[in-house]
Amino acid sequence: EPPTACREKQYLINSQCCSLCQPGQKLVSDCTEFTETECLPCGESEFLDTWNRETHCHQHKYCDPNLGLRVQQKGTSETDTICTCEEGWHCTSEACESCVLHRSCSPGFGVKQIATGVSDTICEPCPVGFFSNVSSAFEKCHPWTSCETKDLVVQQAGTNKTDVVCGPQDRLR
């Protein structure tokens, strides 16, 4: 009786279980009662990453430098090329098909998380007691200067964009 299901790494065709092609190879012809499955290696710059019955290999992704992309992992017959972005840029999607410049955090905001090749800068507002007076993709919020520890007094209050201004204490004569 012909099988209705096949073992792992096999597929059912013409009431027969045929071996799948291994990663890195494509299907040329199905097996028969008398012959094995015929597979052929993928060409250069092509791949198949699973046991398969594909008749065409997939093309390697191109990490186009004009789009800010660079190769993170070279493609092989069994794996696709993995792209990432040049320094200072990050991918616009999970597939990393193009890159955009890392965003900077405006004055009053600090960097909570520095950007990577795949994620943008995460900014946070500077809380009371902290400030940022620059637009930066790296700078965190800095704490206000402690006038007391310098034996000075606050002459001008700090904001989320400016540090406190310290001055000498008024001395009673």
Epitope: P23, G24, P41, C42, G43, E44, S45, E46, D49, Q59, H60, Y62, C63, R70, V71, Q72, Q73, K74, G75, T76, S77, E78, T79, D80
Partner: antibody
Framework: EVQLVESGGGLVKPGGSRRLSCAAS????????MHWVRQAPGKGLEWVAY????????YYADTVKGRFTISRDNAKNSLYLQMNSLRAEDTAVYYC????????????WGQGTLVTVSS | DIVMTQSPDSLAVSLGERVTMNCKSS????????????LTWHQQKPGQPPKLLIY???TRESGVPDRFSGSGSGTDFTLTISSLQAEDVAVYYC?????????FGGGTKVEIK
């Protein structure tokens, strides 16, 4: 028998141009990726550029980006390297090398051609 | 870019002796998809072009004598010649075949003592 034969080397003035060729035989050229690799006199190996079998994918070393152009003509079984704005530091033996779709390594190298950049 | 560091720069060994050279990469050469380390060794004899010796860290190219063996994973790799022959005098280069730009080590020169 696999053969890669480079030509086009010689003496060039700084700022000048040169076009190197690599003639391939003994294998189906259009099935293979190709590289250029150079070796300065008495120094180690430096990868220069890669072109995929079907011309679709091209990568360059930062040291030559914008100055060198790799290309191929599968009908003529030939690989090329157009070198512009040459500098003294480009002086080297230039090798072409083949990359197959199995190992993904440079499995055959040509004998090389010497490019000397000097005034 | 991945930096490949070879050691020693050179070594002189008697015929028939064992030769070991090392190669260190600044980042892992392990392909996450197929679990192969893309580290390649090339041999360059005096006055000749390089020749592929070993790929995927430990797979000998066809025609390469079995006295040559490669080992390692991740960032640390070794090339061993079990019994040095006169024809093995050469410079041996390890190469990152994992990502572009492809990068080579500075080479290890093997001479006869």
């Amino acid at each position: 028998e696999v053969q890669l034969v480079e030509s086009g080397g010689g003496l060039v003035k700084p700022g000048g141009s040169r076009r190197l060729s690599c003639a391939a035989s003994g294998f189906t050229f259009s099935d293979y990726g190709m590289h250029w690799v150079r070796q300065a006199p008495g120094k180690g190996l430096e990868w220069v550029a890669y072109i995929s079998s079907g011309n679709r994918i091209i990568y360059y070393a930062d040291t030559v980006k914008g100055r060198f152009t790799i290309s191929r003509d599968n009908a003529k079984n030939s690989l090329y390297l157009q070198m512009n704005s040459l500098r003294a530091e480009d002086t080297a033996v230039y090798y072409c090398a083949r990359q197959d779709g199995y190992r993904y390594a440079m499995d055959y190298w040509g004998q090389g051609t010497l490019v000397t950049v000097s005034s | 870019d991945i930096v490949m560091t070879q050691s020693p720069d050179s070594l002189a060994v008697s015929l028939g002796e064992r030769v070991t050279m090392n190669c260190k990469s600044s980042q892992s050469l392990l392909n996450s998809g197929n679990q192969k380390n893309y580290l390649t060794w090339h041999q360059q004899k005096p006055g000749q072009p390089p020749k592929l010796l070993i790929y995927w860290t430990s797979t000998r190219e066809s025609g390469v004598p079995d006295r040559f063996s490669g080992s390692g994973s991740g960032t640390d790799f070794t090339l061993t010649i079990s019994s040095l022959q006169a024809e093995d005098v050469a410079v041996y280069y390890c190469q990152n075949d994992y990502t572009y730009p492809l990068t080579f080590g500075g080479g290890t020169k093997v001479e006869i003592k």
